[in-house]
């Protein structure tokens, strides 16, 4: 979370942004929120990004304006327009490419005066892991798989009963480049588990920590994923 | 209550042919993958075969492998097995039971029917 203040004679306005991570190939968005005004025609909004000259994204006058966007964000940004007048300069970004990563910064002017506040971009891939009964191995198994991820993460077992232990010696963990080169499948084989236990399938790189568990009883299998980002908000 | 109820032994010639049939109330049968286990008088039990619940898939134990095959039909809420090529060390009492997975470590079944008697002699 970054506040910034911004002072235009004796006016200044807040204006918050939140740490965020993209996941490439997919559809972002970079949050900002500033003190909210209802003239919405006085109310410009800039996007910019270290290291690149030219706008990320403008809005003003109660529409966009990019006649000074930068090449590498054509047709990829939107900012919310029906809720720009309650305070919301969050950017919509299509399509997250590694190359989105950096340091952005929300710039707000309205009636009231003016103020800014940067946020940091995390681009990667992360998605929620599946774990199922694997009939493949010879001994009762379960298999965690996941089929995005970058950078490659670490993959780690737990299990509710043996809290503490160790499982790499019974696990087998691999990771396979997608067809765009860039992310990963993850698929990790836990051996020897046995019924009425929850086993868990960690998955985590700098970008984010994902989870999925399982319960195997004579009745049914109970399963469970959670998916959060790291270092956000 | 879970009852499965099994039914089509007999005695029957060496080379012979079977089908034994289990009758399953009491849970949701497509829910749960349905397995055949026997057991040699005096031995212990031994898993036999397995079915998922939309029967995409089958397995069996070695000795089978070639000569039973396992079907289900959830209208019906029964599966079967078909015993072809019989041999006298065939000979058991066939039990069906259910299980979450396909897994089948015999210490993990909790419901058992009656059992079926297959007897293979001449």
């Known amino acids: 979370l970054i506040i910034g203040f911004g002072i235009s004679g004796k006016h200044f306005i807040t204006v918050t942004t939140f740490t965020s991570a993209g996941n490439i190939g997919e559809d972002g968005t970079l949050s900002c929120t500033f003190e909210p005004d209802i003239k919405l025609n006085g109310i410009v909004i800039q996007w910019l990004k270290e290291g690149i000259k030219g706008l990320v994204h403008e809005f003003k006058e109660g529409k966009d304006d990019l006649s000074q966007q930068h090449e590498m964000f054509r047709g990829r940004t939107a900012v919310f327009a029906d809720q720009v007048v309650v305070g919301n300069a969050s950017l919509r970004l299509k399509n997250v490419q590694l190359t989105d990563a950096g340091t952005y910064t929300c710039y707000i002017r309205t009636s009231k005066g003016k103020g800014n506040a940067n946020l940091e971009y995390k681009t990667g891939a992360f998605s929620m892991p599946e774990i199922n009964v694997d009939y493949n191995a010879s001994s009762e198994s379960l298999r965690c798989e996941a089929p995005r991820w970058f950078p490659q993460p670490t993959v780690a077992w737990a299990s509710q009963v043996d809290q503490g232990a160790n499982f790499s010696e019974v696990s087998n963990t691999s990771f396979e480049l997608n067809s765009e080169n860039v992310t990963m499948k993850v698929v990790s084989v836990l051996y020897n588990v046995t019924i009425n236990n929850t086993y868990s399938c960690m998955i985590e790189n700098d970008i984010a920590k994902a989870t999925g568990d399982i319960k195997v009883t004579d009745s049914e299998v109970k399963r469970r994923s959670q998916l959060q980002l790291l270092n956000s908000g | 209550e879970v009852q499965l109820v099994e039914s089509g032994g007999g005695l029957v010639q060496p080379g012979g042919s079977l089908r034994l049939s289990c009758a399953a109330s009491?849970?949701?049968?497509?829910?749960?993958?349905m397995h055949w286990v026997r057991q040699v008088p005096g031995k212990g039990r031994e898993w036999v075969s397995r079915?998922?619940?939309?029967?995409?898939?089958?397995s069996y134990e070695d000795s089978v492998k070639g000569r039973f095959t396992i079907s289900r039909d959830n209208a019906k809420n029964t599966v079967y097995l078909q015993m072809h090529g019989l041999r006298a060390e065939d000979t058991a009492v066939y039990y069906c039971?259910?299980?979450?997975?396909?897994?089948?470590?015999?210490?993990?079944?909790?419901?058992w029917g009656q059992g079926t008697l297959v007897t293979v002699s001449s």
């Open positions: 009491g849970f949701t049968f497509t829910d749960f993958w």
């Open positions: 039971t259910r299980f979450s997975t396909g897994w089948h470590r015999i210490e993990y079944f909790q419901h």
């Open positions: 079915i998922s619940p939309d029967s995409s898939s089958t």
